[in-house]
């Protein structure tokens, strides 16, 4: 019983939440809250938007982003791409892990020019010590953050 | 090996399924089937729509709801909100954990009067003993329950 | 500590990815890549599109499919069904586990005839040794595979 409890307490897990500072507009990944409210890190590190593995193994990684807008401004892509990407010292470029494409702008109803849509990604990937996972959304201007419950990013070892 | 198997057998987990009685129309949370078919409880309790933690720790909680309709009836909001909420003795009000907003009614095509959409939520949250998690959908009349495979609610300790 | 690490290394898990050969057009389930790139099997087997349990227990199973098209061809159903199904020697027919219905064709915007949508399913189910889980999409012609990051299928024991 002690063994079982210890194994849960040590199992790497994290849940990071959206915040006003999440959208940088710099072309970088989304940034996240790591401590306040529902956010926490247990056996994983955080660095500039990335969850960083401290222990090698398979992790279920997940992210949800809340999308929303009024109509679909011409300057915005009509296709939104939401993805989880791996950064590793072994490759110079980010590696796509899990990706979704949506066309949410067409969801405005005849009644309402405002539309909402949500994109959820989750899957098991292998991470070596020091490897990082980040979230990107293109076009990030359509991401709605608010209170940390609608857009988030997390992981746990399986 | 015995230790490893025991740890799996004792690990809190649950999967609850939609049923005809899930929609109360009372403004309360959705109710769920806990025993029949695919539904089960292992190390978690159930009470009036809520999964109740018997063991403190981090849980991956999830819910999917199937939404459907013909057009978008006037009495229904054009935005549907699907959320997982925590009830705790420490606060008088429910706490938002994971929330999605969708605008599904605009999805009927010229080809089709009937539209379908699905909302999935999942994420890691901390629960103390006795804390509860419930699912709410506004407007719940658009939720399709029926056979238990299209709308469901579950959790497991990570 | 050794015990805990061993338990993770032995915990059944898999992540299978979409490939050019995934869509058979034969009415069968989707087929998957099991070794290349992000795909792996650990303590689970694979057979003709199915993840096969080697160890009885509760598994979190998941699948995402990327859907896309140009308009909505009349020959295609306007409702897309994405589901996870169990095959067991105890029943002659597949058993629905987790299912979603979407109406993605209505998502083309006035800006763009091309639409994209994504369907994610995940939930905890019980599998006996030898029982299989497969993914089906109707109509599978709308599934977009590309590089294995957009459509995938996985599981891990909880």
């Amino acid at each position: 019983l002690i063994q079982e409890r210890r194994s849960h307490q040590n199992n790497p897990a994290a849940h990071l939440t959206g915040a006003n500072s999440s959208l940088t507009g710099s072309g970088g990944p989304l940034l996240w809250e790591t401590q306040l409210g529902l956010a926490f890190l247990r056996g994983l590190d955080y660095h500039d938007g990335a969850l960083v593995a401290n222990k090698a193994g398979y992790y279920y990684i997940y992210s949800k982003v809340q999308l929303g807008g009024v109509g679909c401004p011409l300057g915005l892509a009509s296709t939104i791409t939401h993805g989880l990407y791996k950064r590793t010292p072994r490759y110079p470029e980010e590696l796509e892990l899990l990706v979704s494409q949506q066309s949410p702008c067409g969801r405005a109803t005849s009644n309402s020019r405002v539309w909402w849509d949500s994109s959820f990604l989750g899957g098991v990937v292998h991470l070596e010590v020091g490897e990082e996972v980040v979230v990107r959304v293109l076009d990030e201007r359509l991401v709605r953050l608010r209170d940390g419950t609608r857009s988030y990013f997390g992981a746990f070892m399986v | 090996l015995i230790q490893e198997r025991r740890s799996h057998q004792n690990n809190p987990a649950a999967h609850l399924t939609g049923a005809n009685s899930s929609l109360t129309g009372s403004g309360g949370p959705l109710l769920w089937e806990t025993q029949l078919g695919l539904a089960f409880l292992r190390g978690l309790d159930y009470h009036d729509g809520a999964l109740v933690a018997n063991k403190a720790g981090y849980y991956y909680i999830y819910s999917k709801v199937q939404l459907g309709g013909v057009g978008c009836p006037l009495g229904l909001a054009s935005t549907i909100t699907h959320g997982l909420y925590k009830r705790t003795p420490r606060y008088p009000e429910e706490l938002e954990l994971l929330v999605s907003q969708q605008s599904p009614c605009g999805r009927a095509t010229s080809n089709s009067r009937v539209w379908w959409d699905s909302s999935f939520l999942g994420g890691v949250v901390h629960l103390e003993v006795g804390e509860e998690v419930v699912v709410r959908v506004l407007d719940e009349r658009l939720v399709r329950l029926r056979d238990g495979t299209r709308s469901y609610f579950g959790a497991f300790m990570v | 500590l050794i015990q805990e690490r061993r338990s993770h290394q032995n915990n059944p898990a898999a992540h299978l990815t979409g490939a050019n050969s995934s869509l058979t057009g034969s009415g069968g389930p989707l087929l998957w890549e099991t070794q290349l790139g992000l795909a792996f099997l650990r303590g689970l087997d694979y057979h003709d599109g199915a993840l096969v349990a080697n160890k009885a227990g509760y598994y979190y199973i998941y699948s995402k499919v990327q859907l896309g098209g140009v308009g909505c061809p009349l020959g295609l159903a306007s409702t897309i069904t994405h589901g996870l199904y169990k095959r067991t020697p105890r029943y002659p027919e597949e058993l629905e586990l987790l299912v979603s219905q979407q109406s993605p064709c209505g998502r083309a915007t006035s800006n763009s005839r091309v639409w994209w949508d994504s369907s994610f399913l995940g939930g905890v189910v019980h599998l006996e040794v030898g029982e299989e889980v497969v993914v089906r999409v109707l109509d599978e012609r709308l599934v977009r595979l590309r590089d294995g990051t957009r459509s995938y299928f996985g599981a891990f024991m909880v």
Partner: antibody, heavy 121, light 107 residues
């Protein structure tokens, strides 16, 4: 109880006009799509028009397009069918029907008793 | 327009018989199909919606099945009030259409 009552039918000459009404009671009228369906003597059922609850989106069968107009007044719990340029083949019993369209419940579950329209010279 | 073809157009059966009526759609309508019963001089009554869902208050001897293009209505044990005309109707696509009807008569 839930009820639909049609009125306004009668005998009319070819080329003439009629306005049918359907009074709803016992339910929240504004939550439902409403349909008009007709049945010629000794024949099957033919859908002719519907109107959405939310934004008054309207569709017609080709056989009546340009001649018939469906409308509703949610404040009065009433559905209407304005029929112009009537032809002999429009002779039928006209039914209004409520259509459910959300979640687990679909279909035209409540029908009126029908009103007879006869087009004859 | 989507055409619904019912078969047979008529059939003779006795009380207690099992009866099956088919409805074929000219293109895929998913599960957006309803079945109605109409007795002479009466309004149509909804029996089944969404291809297989039994309407509240309808006896369980009525069973709907199928999806896509092929649908069936089965009456497991015919009762006297079941001698009537049965219609299928698709509500997936405009214009809404009904099948031509199947008349169930007393043998």
């Amino acid at each position: 109880q839930v009820q639909l009552v049609e009125s306004g039918g009668g005998l009319v000459k070819p080329g003439g006009s009629l306005r049918l009404s359907c009074a709803a009671s016992g339910f929240t009228f504004s939550d439902y799509y409403m349909n008009w369906i007709r049945q010629a003597p000794g024949k099957g059922l033919e859908w002719i028009a519907d109107i959405s609850s939310r934004d008054n989106t309207i569709y017609y069968a080709d056989s009546v397009k340009g001649r018939f107009t469906i409308s509703r007044d949610n404040a009065k719990n009433s559905l209407y069918l304005q029929m112009n340029s009537l032809r002999a083949e429009d002779t039928a019993v006209y039914y209004c029907a409520r259509e459910r369209g959300f979640g687990d419940y679909f279909g035209m579950d409540v029908w009126g008793q029908g009103t007879t329209v006869t087009v004859s010279s | 327009a989507i055409q619904l073809t019912q078969s047979p157009s008529s059939l003779s059966a006795s009380v207690g018989d099992r009866v099956t009526i088919a409805c074929r759609a000219s293109q895929d309508i998913s599960s957006a199909l309803a079945w109605f019963r109409q007795t002479p001089g009466k309004t149509p009554k909804l029996l089944i919606y969404d291809a297989s869902s039994l309407e509240s208050g309808v006896p369980s001897r009525f069973l709907g099945s199928g999806s896509g293009t092929d649908f069936t209505l089965t009456i497991s044990s015919l009762q006297p009030e079941d001698f009537a005309i049965y219609y299928c109707q698709q509500f997936n696509t405009y214009p809404l259409t009904f099948g031509g009807g199947t008349k169930v008569e007393i043998k």
